[in-house]
Interface confidence: low
Amino acid sequence: PKQTLPKPIIRAESTYMVPKEKQATLCCQGSYGAVEYQLHFEGSLFAVERPKPPERINGVKFHIPDMNSRKAGRYSCIYRVGELWSERSDLLDLVVTEMYDTPTLSVHPGPEVTSGEKVTFYCRLDTATSMFLLLKEGRSRDVQRSYGKVQAEFPMGPVTTAHRGSYRCFGSYNNYAWSFPSEPVKLLVTGDIENTSLAPTDPTFPDSWDTCLLTRETGLQKDLALWDHTAQN
C-alpha cells in the first residue's frame, strides 16, 4: 500500500454557520514541515496554501470570502510533506445562513417550566421549506432536525436543568442553506439542583473547540496560539 501521512484536522474558526456574503475561515491542522495544504470542496480542489516557513507551522487558515449557497457544503483538506501526501481529513459541513426568511420559535407550555415537565418547541416558517433545525446556543453541533410544511415540532420530553439556555431555530432550504435564525427563546427550568449552570447565550453559537488552535515552533519551545501563518511573513 502507498505510504501516507496522518490525516489533518479540519475545523471552522468561530462557527461553521456563516451568514451569506460574510467570510468563513477554515483551519487545516497538519504537520510541521508541510509545504502545501489543499482545501477540497465537494471533492474538488478549492484552494491552496503554502505556509512560510513550513518547518515552524503546523497548519493554515483558508479564508472563504462572500459566503453563498454555492460555497456551502462539504469541505476537507490534505497536506504534503516533500512528495508525500496525507490522508484526507474528515469532512466538515459548512452552512450558509441568513437566506430568505426568518422563522418564529415558540415553546410550550412556556419558557419557564419545572424539572420533569414535558416541553415542545415549535418552529414556523411560512415560505417553502420542509426541514427545520433547532439549536441550543453553545451547543451548535447538537442540531435537532424535524420536518413539516410550515411548522415543525421538537418534543424535548421531560426536561432537566441541563436543558436550560437559549434556543434558536432555522428553516433549511437544503442541508447547507439555512434561513435567518429565529429570535432566541430562553428556556428556564427550575426545581432541580443537580446542574444549575446556565448555557452560554452568544448568538453566534460558539463551540469551544471551534477555534483554530494552530501552533508555531520557536526553537525548542512550542507556543500554543491562535496562529495565522501569515504572521511569519
Epitope: E21, Q23, P65, D228, T230
Partner: antibody, heavy 122, light 107 residues
Framework: QVQLQESGPGLVKPSQTLSLTCTVS?????????WNWIRQPPGKGLEWMGY???????SYNPSLESRITISRDTSKNQFSLKLSSVTAADTAVYYC???????????????WGQGTLVTVSS | DIQMTQSPSSLSASVGDRVTITCRVS??????LAWYQQKPGKAPKLLVY???TLAEGVPSRFSGSGSGTDFTLTISSLQPEDFATYYC?????????FGGGTKVEIK
C-alpha cells in the same frame, strides 16, 4: 513580481460607458485570487467597485450593480471594467488591484496599478 | 453596508512622534481589517491586514491592534516618509468599504 497596469480613455461623455482594462504581468489571473476595481474621486476616499475571480465569478458593489460589468480576457491576462450611464460623479482615479494575500481574504489589496484618471465631462 | 469611521480626519505631528489613528466599524468584523498608506498621486500601499499582521516590507514602527469594532494603527516613531493619508478597510463580507482617511501632516 506581480504588476498591474490600467489603460483606457481619460475622458468620457456623460451618459456614455466608461471602459478600462487592467493588464497583469508576473501572475496568471486564472491561477488564484480576485481581481478588483477600486476608484477614488479627486480629493476623496476609496470605493471598492467589484471583482472577477480566478475562476471567472464576479461580485459587485450593490451601489453600482445596475451599471457595472467586470470581464476578463485570459489569453491576454487582462480584466476589464465597464461602467454605463456615467455622470460627473463617476470622475475618479480608477485602480485595478489584486485581492488576496498570504492566506488572508480576497478583500486585502497588496498589489495595485498606478491608477488612471477618468473625467466625465461633455 | 459596513460603515468605517476614522479619527481624526487629519493630524499634525513631528518626526519622532508616536501617532495613533483609530477606526471604528459599524458592526463586528472580528479581525478582518486592513490599513493602507497613500501618498499624493500614488496608489495605496498595504501596511497591515488581519488587524495586526504587517505586510511584507513594512517597517516595524507600524503596528495594528484591535478586534470587533475598534481598531488602531500606531506609528511608534514618525519618519519623514510617513507623512501621508492612511485608510482603514474591512475585508469581512462584500461590499468591502474604506474609512474616510486620516491625513498625517508635518507640524
Amino acid at each position: 513580481q506581480v504588476q498591474l497596469q490600467e489603460s483606457g480613455p481619460g475622458l468620457v461623455k456623460p451618459s456614455q460607458t466608461l471602459s478600462l482594462t487592467c493588464t497583469v504581468s508576473g501572475y496568471s489571473i486564472t491561477s488564484d485570487y480576485a481581481w478588483n476595481w477600486i476608484r477614488q474621486p479627486p480629493g476623496k476616499g476609496l470605493e471598492w467597485m467589484g471583482y472577477i475571480t480566478y475562476s471567472g465569478s464576479t461580485s459587485y458593489n450593490p451601489s453600482l450593480e445596475s451599471r457595472i460589468t467586470i470581464s476578463r480576457d485570459t489569453s491576454k491576462n487582462q480584466f476589464s471594467l465597464k461602467l454605463s450611464s456615467v455622470t460627473a460623479a463617476d470622475t475618479a482615479v480608477y485602480y485595478c488591484a489584486r485581492g488576496g494575500y498570504y492566506g488572508s481574504s480576497w478583500g486585502v489589496f497588496a498589489y495595485w496599478g498606478q491608477g488612471t484618471l477618468v473625467t466625465v465631462s461633455s | 453596508d459596513i460603515q468605517m469611521t476614522q479619527s481624526p480626519s487629519s493630524l499634525s505631528a513631528s518626526v519622532g512622534d508616536r501617532v495613533t489613528i483609530t477606526c471604528r466599524v459599524s458592526e463586528n468584523i472580528y479581525s478582518y481589517l486592513a490599513w493602507y498608506q497613500q501618498k499624493p498621486g500614488k496608489a495605496p500601499k498595504l501596511l497591515v491586514y488581519n488587524a495586526k499582521t504587517l505586510a511584507e516590507g513594512v517597517p516595524s514602527r507600524f503596528s495594528g491592534s484591535g478586534s470587533g469594532t475598534d481598531f488602531t494603527l500606531t506609528i511608534s516613531s514618525l519618519q519623514p516618509e510617513d507623512f501621508a493619508t492612511y485608510y482603514c478597510q474591512h475585508h469581512y463580507g462584500t461590499p468591502w468599504t474604506f474609512g474616510g482617511g486620516t491625513k498625517v501632516e508635518i507640524k
